[in-house]
């Protein structure tokens, strides 16, 4: 007996061939011997089965001895053994129809779980193997669960259902709602304008929701809201902004914030949260601000940084075109009685300069 696997909602063609390449009598019946369709004279006739309105045959191939049955808009309950009677012989074809669907909306927040459920006919014992767009392989039976979705899980998932050495492939489009980056750090000299950008890792026709940037300044004992906003059809409107600092926000996506001046008291880390309409939970992006200040006071030249820096970062004071350098894996370096000239303060990570500030030391006579 031949086994054919079908997908719920799809169309399947069950083939039946006569030895003579000519038009002849044929019938398709189900396992209960109820006629589905057949030929009477030159016409296709349909029996009283539940399939009658969805079953058809390729008349153009009859004179070649091909008497296939086409079933449209497959249902799980169409799974059955179908019998083709032609030239006094019977050909049996077992049709197994499977369905694979996501248990919830296919637009899911990062960190949420995805469950794929397999619908299968009674008595079948299929196995399912899914491959994510990022190449992650997950196997299961009737259900497949991905406990915590990541950005890279966005895209088309390919799932293969196997039964009796036959396979059928499903493609499910999953959109993971997340920011493009989990975290970003902005390095600025004191007084410079700061730009924070929060691009999304997805596009939606209509994007509506609300959000907030919550900030923990390194120097402050507690965190506070810097700005709250609404998003209506991709248009941003500010709801409330703190008086210090006076942030500005772009009116269009991507979400964009401007801090007029980088100051030591603003250095720290923030969390931008975005709630989307009809979704429970929020998208998050961490943002860090590191501020550098180089100052000369009396006989002391000092360079300081504020904000979240890793212990492996190096802070250096270097006299331009001279070898004089002082370096430390610390948040402040200084030189007593510095030579006159242009000094550079550098914040670097394994030789890569992240931030630099120049300060001119004038000779004292």
């Amino acid at each position: 007996k031949k086994v054919v696997l079908g997908k719920k909602g799809d169309t399947v063609e069950l083939t039946c061939n006569a030895s003579q390449k000519k038009n002849t009598q044929f019938h398709w019946k189900n396992s209960n011997q109820i006629k589905i369709l057949g030929i009477q004279g030159l016409f296709l006739t349909k029996g009283p089965s539940k399939l009658s309105d969805r079953a058809d045959s390729r008349k153009s191939l009859w004179d070649q001895g091909c008497f296939s049955m086409i079933i449209k808009n497959l249902k799980i309950e169409d799974s059955d053994t179908y019998i083709c009677e032609v030239e006094n012989k019977k050909e049996e074809v077992e049709l197994l129809v499977f369905g694979l669907t996501a248990n919830s909306d296919t637009h899911l927040l990062e960190g949420q779980s995805l469950t794929l459920t397999l619908e299968s006919p009674p008595g079948s014992s299929p196995s399912v193997k899914c491959r994510s767009p990022g190449g992650k392989n997950i196997q299961g039976g009737r259900t497949i669960s991905v406990p915590q979705l990541e950005r890279q899980d966005s895209g088309t998932w390919t799932c293969t259902v196997s039964q009796d050495q036959k396979t059928v492939e499903f493609k499910i489009d999953i959109v993971v709602l997340a920011f493009q980056k989990a975290s970003s750090t902005v390095y600025k000299k004191e007084g410079e304008q700061v730009e924070f950008s929060f691009p999304l890792a997805f596009t939606l026709e209509k994007l509506t929701g609300s959000g907030e940037l919550w900030w923990q300044a390194e120097r402050a004992s507690s965190s506070k809201s810097w700005i709250t906003f609404d998003l209506k059809n991709k248009e941003v409107s500010v709801k409330r902004v703190t008086q210090d600092p006076k942030l500005q926000m772009g009116k269009k996506l991507p979400l964009h914030l401007t801090l007029p001046q980088a100051l030591p008291q603003y250095a720290g880390s923030g969390n931008l949260t975005l709630a989307l309409e009809a979704k429970t939970g929020k998208l998050h992006q961490e943002v860090n601000l590191v501020v550098m200040r180089a100052t000369q006071f009396q006989e002391n030249l000092t360079c300081e940084v504020w904000g979240p820096t890793s212990p492996k970062l190096t802070l250096s004071l270097k006299l331009e075109n001279k070898g004089a350098t002082v370096s430390k894996q610390a948040k402040a370096v200084w030189v007593l009685n510095p030579e006159a000239g242009m000094w550079q303060c550098l914040l670097s990570d394994s030789g890569q300069v992240l931030l630099e500030s120049n300060i001119k030391v004038v000779p004292t006579w």
Partner: antibody, heavy 119, light 107 residues
Framework: EVQLVESGGGLVQPGGSLRLSCAAS????????MSWVRQAPGKGLEWVAN????????YYVDSVKGRFTISRDNAKNSLYLQMNSLRAEDTAVHYC????????????WGQGTLVTVSS | DIQMTQSPSSVSGSVGDRVTITCRAS??????LAWYQQKPGKAPKLLIY???SLQSGVPSRFSGSGSGTDFTLTISSLQPEDFVTYYC?????????FGQGTKVEIK
């Protein structure tokens, strides 16, 4: 530790006036919007008014507009509610509240002061 | 003004039960919704902000969901101290408004 302590409640006749005060400590008072929320005996919560960090913006519920005035003195870490033309329906415990929670939530509440308007 | 309608006005349960309180806004408020708990004779305490985020220090048996106009507060397993009153509040537009409250009572 954040602390909000209300005072100034008491018994007053209809048409009379009362000034509620709230002394704030444990946080940078001048960095937060502040609210007054009240609760009539055995009833639910009703937001009354709020004020911006520097006092430049004020909002009121319709039932108190023109009768109540919210103000603040950042130098004294104090919030005030001047209540004029008091009515029996103003009888309630009045809470001083900080609007410092994420997503504009009311994160710290005082213990409340009872205002009774009765003849 | 935005009307906030809480239901039910009271609910009975036993220790360990799961309880759900709903709050409906008369117009869309996105996620500008907070839930508060109030014990008799005490000031309210913030439980949930932004419709679904748990305030620091609040037990994880409390959870919030919803956006737009329909919101829920769920207590997954009632504890003896949870038999008090709960309020929802919108912060979408002035005046801020509260639901009428839901009293959780011992069965």
């Amino acid at each position: 530790e954040v602390q909000l302590v209300e005072s100034g409640g008491g018994l007053v006749q209809p048409g009379g006036s009362l000034r509620l005060s709230c002394a704030a400590s444990g946080f940078t008072f001048s960095s937060y919007w502040m609210s007054w929320v009240r609760q009539a005996p055995g009833k639910g919560l009703e937001w009354v008014a709020n004020i911006k960090e520097d006092g430049s913006d004020k909002y009121y519920v319709d039932s108190v507009k023109g009768r109540f005035t919210i103000s603040r003195d950042n130098a004294k870490n104090s919030l005030y509610l001047q209540m004029n033309s008091l009515r029996a329906e103003d009888t309630a415990v009045h809470y001083c509240v900080r609007e410092g929670g994420q997503w504009l939530a009311l994160d710290y509440w005082g213990q409340g002061t009872l205002v009774t308007v009765s003849s | 003004d935005i009307q906030m309608t809480q239901s039910p006005s009271s609910v009975s349960g036993s220790v360990g039960d799961r309880v759900t309180i709903t709050c409906r806004a008369s117009q869309g408020i996105s996620s500008w919704l907070a839930w508060y708990q109030q014990k008799p004779g005490k000031a309210p305490k913030l439980l949930i902000y932004g419709a679904s985020s748990l305030q620091s220090g609040v037990p994880s048996r409390f959870s919030g969901s919803g956006s737009g106009t329909d919101f829920t507060l769920t207590i997954s397993s009632l504890q003896p101290e949870d038999f008090v009153t709960y309020y929802c509040q919108q912060a979408n537009s002035f005046p801020w408004t509260f639901g009428q409250g839901t009293k959780v009572e011992i069965k």
